[in-house]
Interface confidence: medium
């Protein structure tokens, strides 16, 4: 069996996880993609997914999670804004390909969120400027309910990263402390 490896992020409350999941362009560009959390001994739980078929660079927001699928580059961008300690846990990106099981995009992401000063949006160490706003849309109903039994893991830390949809939009101009870690080719 393939050894499941993890990539670790250490962030503070209020910061933003900002990651990408690469996929094979030709095969999966328009496939529906999802962001899942894997809790201790449980099946992966889908927190957010793209539309079906997935639209190119169209932001989908579910609560504090924002997904953007860049077909031309073969990458899904995932952001979790205003992180909380309870968001700590193990995450993964998957591609839905019914009737087959979801295809997992390696590696898994180990998120560790710790308490610490994060200030209010705009008061932090940096600024992110984005040309558009993300509308408050909910796409939970569009996400398939099945998950792969193969992806059950051995006791990762408990997490309660359930996501609620906010009443107002998130203006990404005010999101601070985005963490971007590298890709070196």
């Amino acid at each position: 069996a393939t050894k499941l490896t993890e990539e670790k992020y250490e962030l503070k409350e209020g910061q933003t996880l900002d990651v990408k999941c690469d996929y094979t362009l030709e095969k999966f560009a328009s496939s529906q993609k999802a962001w899942q959390i894997i809790r201790d001994g449980e099946m992966p739980k889908t927190l957010a997914c793209t539309e079906r078929p997935s639209k190119n660079s169209h932001p989908v927001q579910v609560g504090r999670i924002i997904l953007e699928d860049y077909h031309d580059h073969g990458l899904l961008r995932v952001r979790m804004v205003n992180l909380q300690v309870e968001d700590s846990g193990l995450y993964q990106c998957v591609i839905y390909q019914p009737p087959k099981e979801p295809h997992m995009l390696f590696d898994r992401i180990r998120l560790v969120v710790t308490k610490g000063f994060s200030g209010t949006p705009g008061s932090n160490e940096n600024s992110t400027q984005n040309v558009y706003k993300i509308p408050p849309t909910t796409t939970k109903a569009l996400c398939p309910l099945y998950t792969s039994p193969r992806t059950v893991t051995q006791a990762p830390p408990k997490s309660t990263a359930d996501v609620s949809t906010p009443d107002s939009e998130i203006n990404l101009t005010n999101v601070t402390d985005i963490i971007r870690v590298p890709v070196f080719n």
Epitope: T5, E7, V19, I179, R180
Partner: antibody, heavy 127, light 107 residues
Amino acid sequence: QVQLVQSGAEVKKPGSSVKVSCKSSGGTFSSYAFTWVRQAPGQGLEWMGGIIPIFRTANYAQKFQGRVTITADESTSTAYMELSSLRSEDTAVYYCASSHFSGSGSSHYYYYGMHVWGQGTTVTVSS
Amino acid sequence: DIQMTQSPTSLSASVGDRVTITCRASQGISSWLAWYQQKPEKAPKSLIYAASSLQSGVPSRFSGSGSGTDFTLTISSLQPEDFATYYCQQYNSYPYTFGQGTKLEIK
């Protein structure tokens, strides 16, 4: 391998602005992230901010917030850094740097990497 | 901001010596650390990323190690072209910050 060529040296008056360009060649511009770093005479390196063209986002160090604007023009494969309200302490060599970030296979990580560097642009602020 | 502290700030060594430069972060940064080499009047050059991965084209005498808060850059056998200033840099969180530099001089 991508190559970065920066614009020439500039001499500016305090209070004015400077716009430094960084032209990329040898790679797909939109697959790269661009960073700006400066180095004052005899000093160390200081990260100013960066841009990922396909995400249409720029990030800036708080120190430069409100004075710096980083942009990218995909049609000319050029990244720009504009610094306004110049003061004498902005006298420095300004470097652009880049790294490839998409299509990397297994890694989820991307960032404003500094694998390839431009030759640097000297900006002198003097009255 | 995360503070990066390098030691020593300057170092004299001879060709063939084994040299170690250390870098300490003021808080945990996982393995998100890079090392750069800079020669006078030149742009920096990337040596190491992700604490221990060697940048393409960099000689294997350079190596990096560490995670969390403590990191090292080691040059196993100094060559004449290695005399330069070395910087560490964290990219765990914004603003990315550099160490103050370590100047490696010929003894």
